[in-house]
């Protein structure tokens, strides 16, 4: 913490301007009034403060707003945003997309994924839901940031907004997030024709249940291996060899290349070896011919 000193009269600050770059840390602490700083935050980013000086300015704002900064200050943080921790940001209430845009621009090129994720979370909370304007802002200024939101936050996305989401925006989404988004996408694209539907639903298929994957296998979609390997393990395991062959079409050859990777490996182990042999790919590890498969989990459920 910066030690408290009294401000020399000749150093008194009446406005935030470039002269402050010549102030030492303790002079900034003693001479800059926090309320003046907050009122003139829009000037701060144009002044080439050192990171040490920015630390002092942050400290002043923290003292003035222990419960979190008001949006009027947040909007003009500029490079001071780089000094914020997720804990600082968690105290904010942000509703303006202009504020979000400004801070996303500042964070670009810096390792701030945790701060950005928290900021986006605060915006969604502040606006009440993940509306189309918010999604459009995220896709434009922060591709992939949609996936920084928790499944709980993503559940506030109305299906009507799903069309604005691009495949690259879902790239870093995990299974739990896709579990939330997939049913919304299914609803949003339900009136589309087969091939158009597949193109749209494909990035969301990591959240699809087995029955939907089975249905796709009947539609000549020729699913690529990248999509197949994003499917939930639980959705892939019950598929038959014939269903996987239909689902992948000409891409079925790729199973050989990926046979060591989950979920392909897990699926192979569940198939009869003679069924796998019908693919002619040399896939190994299936259940040997003549073996009986007992599903003990079913028996336990009955007893």
């Amino acid at each position: 913490d910066v030690e408290r000193t009294t401000c020399p009269p000749e150093k008194e600050v009446h406005e935030i301007d470039e002269s402050l770059i010549f102030y030492k840390k303790r002079e900034l602490e003693a001479c800059v009034d926090a309320a003046l700083l907050a009122a003139q935050m829009d000037r701060v980013d144009a002044i080439p403060f050192t990171y040490e000086q920015l630390d002092v300015l942050k400290h002043k704002l923290d003292e003035l707003y222990p419960q979190g900064y008001p949006e009027s200050v947040i909007r003009h943080l500029g490079h001071l945003f780089l000094k914020m921790s997720p804990e600082d940001i968690r105290k904010w209430n942000v509703t303006s997309l202009e504020t979000l845009k400004a801070l996303l621009k500042v964070s670009k090129g810096h390792e701030m994924s945790a701060q950005v994720a928290t900021l986006i979370d605060r915006v969604v909370v502040g606006r009440g839901q993940l509306d189309k304007d918010t999604v459009d802002t995220l896709t434009a200024f922060c591709p992939g940031c949609l996936c920084s939101l928790s499944p709980e936050r993503l559940s506030s996305v109305p299906p009507s907004v799903i069309g604005a989401v691009r495949p690259q925006d879902l790239d870093t989404c995990g299974p739990r997030q896709l579990d939330v988004l997939y049913p919304k996408a299914r609803l949003a694209f339900q009136n589309m024709s087969g091939s158009e539907y597949f193109v749209k639903i494909r990035p969301f298929l990591g959240g699809a249940p087995t029955e939907d994957v089975k249905a796709l296998s009947q539609q000549n979609v020729s699913m690529d291996l990248a999509t197949f390997m994003k499917l939930r393990r639980e959705a892939v395991l019950p598929l038959t060899v014939a269903e996987v062959q239909k689902l992948l079409g000409p891409h079925v050859e790729g199973l050989k290349v990926e046979e060591q990777h989950s979920p392909v490996r897990d699926w192979i182990l569940k198939q009869r070896q003679d069924d796998l042999d019908t693919l002619g790919l040399g896939l190994q590890g299936g259940i040997p011919n003549g073996y009986l498969i007992l599903d003990l989990s079913v028996r336990e459920a009955l007893s």
Partner: antibody, heavy 119, light 106 residues
């Protein structure tokens, strides 16, 4: 334009570990596996292993099991390879190479990271 | 493990000359892939799925073969083709490369 940018050369002591990174740009990171290949001076190429960024599923050439640890960070489109218990035999150039899921070839390669293990 | 044997290990050719190098496999494989590597550079994909030219590769390069015998041909040697060429297989685990053919310009 697709690029795989690897970390710089490393000079390390025997018995230590090193972590090499490979940052991908210009395409969908999760549509490709990231593979790693070793090349000792004047010798051929040796496949170390690969990782699927979607599932973090890894496979290793048995020869490098326990020697190499592959990880990815999807949020930064970066793949990592940690090499442990280093000996002079690990002195080589290490390449990351991108492999489209379901395809058996490497369409883009990093520039290589030279690792020298010497006391 | 599948072993890929490339021959010759070293060869030289004059500009304009036709060049053929081979990759023999100890077990039948579905496809072979070919790479070119120049000193101090990374390998570059030339041919995938035995005979398909990779993006940006000159048409003087071609690949052929099946089963256990594969070859790479350069219809007319150019100075910039001086490099080491490697074949690779992905039909069986672990995935292996040949020992390389070093092609020099006469």
């Amino acid at each position: 334009e697709v690029q795989l940018q690897q970390s710089g050369p490393e000079l390390v002591k025997p018995g230590t570990s090193v972590k090499i990174l490979c940052k991908a740009s210009g395409d969908t990171f999760t549509a490709y596996n990231m593979d790693w290949v070793k090349q000792r001076h004047g010798q051929s190429l040796e496949w170390i292993g690969d990782i699927n960024p979607n599932t973090d599923s890894t496979i290793y050439n048995q020869k490098f099991e326990g020697k190499a640890i592959l990880t990815v960070d999807k949020s930064s489109s970066t793949a990592y390879m940690e090499l442990r218990s280093l000996t002079s035999e690990d002195t080589a150039v290490y390449y990351c190479a991108r492999r489209k899921l379901g395809r058996g070839y490497f369409d883009y390669w990093g520039q290589g990271t030279t690792l020298t293990v010497s006391s | 493990q599948i072993v890929l044997t490339q021959s010759p290990a070293i060869m030289s050719a004059s500009p304009g000359e036709k060049v053929t190098m081979t990759c023999s496999v100890n077990l039948s494989v579905r496809y072979i892939y070919w790479y070119q590597q120049k000193p101090g550079s990374s390998p570059r994909l030339l041919i995938h799925d035995t005979s398909n030219l990779a993006s940006g590769v000159p048409v003087r390069f071609s690949g052929s073969g099946s089963g256990t015998s594969y070859s790479l041909t350069i219809s007319r040697m150019e100075a910039e083709d001086a490099a080491t060429y490697y074949c690779q297989q992905w039909s069986s685990f672990p995935y292996t490369f040949g020992g390389g053919t070093k092609l020099e310009i006469k």
